[in-house]
């Protein structure tokens, strides 16, 4: 969390941003909130990106003002216009690109004063893994698949029964480049699996960490997955 204050002495307002990560090809949100104003027409929101000449987005007098928008953001940004009055200056970003990563500034002007805060935005690819029993294999084998990751992650297997065990000798991980030539499909196979055990396939890069669990018993198979972004710090 980054909290910024205005630089004009007593005429300062608090602006708060949250560092976040964007998933390539998906929509992203750059979070920014500020002390609200009573009149929408008095609020100016400017989003800027370090190293970019034009604006990312501008909203003033109750509407978008995009005549100075940088080419790389054309047709790709929107504020939540109905939430500006309550202090939400967050920006929606369409079809996140690797090149969208960087430092953004959320700059606010209201009748109370000015304020700004920076936001670190990371971009990459991350997806939920799915763990299945590989019935085609000669021995009991688990297959962990996740469709989209970038940068290349690490994959670690763990088991509830053999806590602390190193499965690197009995597992094999491969990375297959997807058609857009950036993200990769992750496939990891774990051999010599025992019954009545819960196995976890953990995939991690500097943006996200995802885990796929599978519980294999005589009578049933239970699966669970979750994904966590690693860099959500507020400012």
């Amino acid at each position: 969390l980054i909290i910024g204050f205005g630089i004009s002495g007593r005429h300062s307002i608090t602006v708060t941003t949250v560092a976040s990560a964007g998933n390539i090809g998906e929509d992203g949100i750059l979070s920014c909130t500020f002390e609200p104003d009573i009149k929408l027409s008095d609020i100016v929101i400017q989003w800027l990106k370090e190293g970019v000449l034009g604006l990312v987005h501008e909203f003033k007098e109750g509407k978008d003002e995009l005549s100075e928008q940088d080419e790389m953001f054309r047709g790709r940004t929107a504020v939540f216009a109905d939430q500006v009055i309550v202090g939400n200056a967050s920006l929606r970003l369409k079809n996140v690109q690797l090149t969208d990563a960087g430092t953004y500034k959320c700059y606010i002007i209201t009748s109370k004063g000015k304020g700004n805060a920076n936001l670190e935005y990371k971009t990459g690819a991350f997806s939920m893994p799915e763990v299945n029993v590989d019935y085609n294999a000669s021995s009991e084998t688990l297959r962990c698949e996740a469709p989209r990751w970038f940068p290349q992650p690490t994959v670690v297997w763990a088991s509830q029964v053999d806590q602390g065990a190193n499965f690197s000798e009995v597992s094999n991980t491969s990375f297959e480049l997807n058609s857009e030539n950036v993200t990769m499909k992750v496939v990891s196979v774990l051999y010599n699996v025992t019954i009545n055990n819960t196995y976890s396939c953990m995939i991690e890069n500097d943006i996200a960490k995802a885990t796929g669990d599978i519980k294999v018993t005589e009578s049933e198979i239970k699966r669970r997955s979750h994904l966590q972004l690693l860099n959500s710090k507020a400012s």
Partner: antibody, heavy 119, light 107 residues
Framework: EVQLVESGGGLVQPGGSLRLSCAVS????????VQWVRQAPGKGLEWLGV???????DYNAAFLSRLTISKDTSKNTVYFQMNSLRAEDTAVYYC?????????????WGQGTLVTVSS | DIQMTQSPSSLSASVGDRVTITCKAS??????VSWYQQKPGKAPKLLIY???NRYTGVPSRFSGSRSGTDFTLTISSLQPEDFATYYC?????????FGQGTKVEIK
């Protein structure tokens, strides 16, 4: 109320040029992009290009060499010019405005102007 | 270019029927699919944007949904004024593209 009104259609000789205008009201050209879409008689919709609030443009690659979209913000008007016309360019040409600045659909359309390419 | 394959190309239905039109994108388009209604000699009208958001003034019988790259427009109870041609379109990546259209006719 948002309105877009096209003009400039009519009969054009093969190999000739076409210049259409789209006069807008009820919104600012510095807030929204304006799209151009055409529809040949009895056929579907085909996207041709867009001019953004900043004045930058994106074109359908199939028309890149012969299409120019421009605007005069002070006159609230967008211009569409296509060169080297052929019979298959006969269509109703529409200008349209996006529903949001992030382009989730075309909410407002002009009435369309018919362009016939024939000798 | 992203292909939007719309089906069926035409259908006959009666007033009160539930009508479903589908559109399949040849690659990922996120939620950037919109649906339009067009009557002869008129400009298209936006019904649904962002895959499932009903545009202002559009009756609640029109709804849109998404499953991966498959998109559906549903008219829950067809009314006489709904007989028209319907198009889907994608605005995820250039060039923006449309489906071939579905003509809804009176049975």
């Amino acid at each position: 109320e948002v309105q877009l009104v096209e003009s400039g259609g009519g009969l054009v000789q093969p190999g000739g040029s076409l210049r259409l205008s789209c006069a807008v009201s009820g919104f600012s050209l510095t807030s929204y992009g304006v799209q151009w879409v055409r529809q040949a008689p009895g056929k579907g919709l085909e996207w041709l290009g867009v001019i953004w609030s900043s004045g930058s443009t994106d074109y359908n690659a199939a028309f890149l060499s012969r299409l120019t979209i421009s605007k005069d913000t002070s006159k609230n008007t967008v211009y569409f010019q296509m060169n080297s016309l052929r019979a298959e360019d006969t269509a109703v040409y529409y200008c349209a405005r996006d529903v949001t600045t992030i382009v989730e659909g075309f909410a407002h359309w002009g009435q369309g102007t018919l362009v016939t390419v024939s000798s | 270019d992203i292909q939007m394959t719309q089906s069926p190309s035409s259908l006959s239905a009666s007033v009160g029927d539930r009508v479903t039109i589908t559109c399949k994108a040849s690659e990922k388009v996120g939620t950037y699919v919109s649906w339009y209604q067009q009557k002869p000699g008129k400009a298209p009208k936006l019904l649904i944007y962002g895959a499932s958001n009903r545009y202002t003034g559009v009756p609640s019988r029109f709804s849109g949904s998404r499953s991966g790259t498959d998109f559906t427009l549903t008219i829950s109870s067809l009314q006489p004024e709904d007989f028209a041609t319907y198009y889907c379109g994608q605005t995820y990546s250039y060039p923006f593209t449309f489906g071939q259209g579905t003509k809804v006719e009176i049975k």
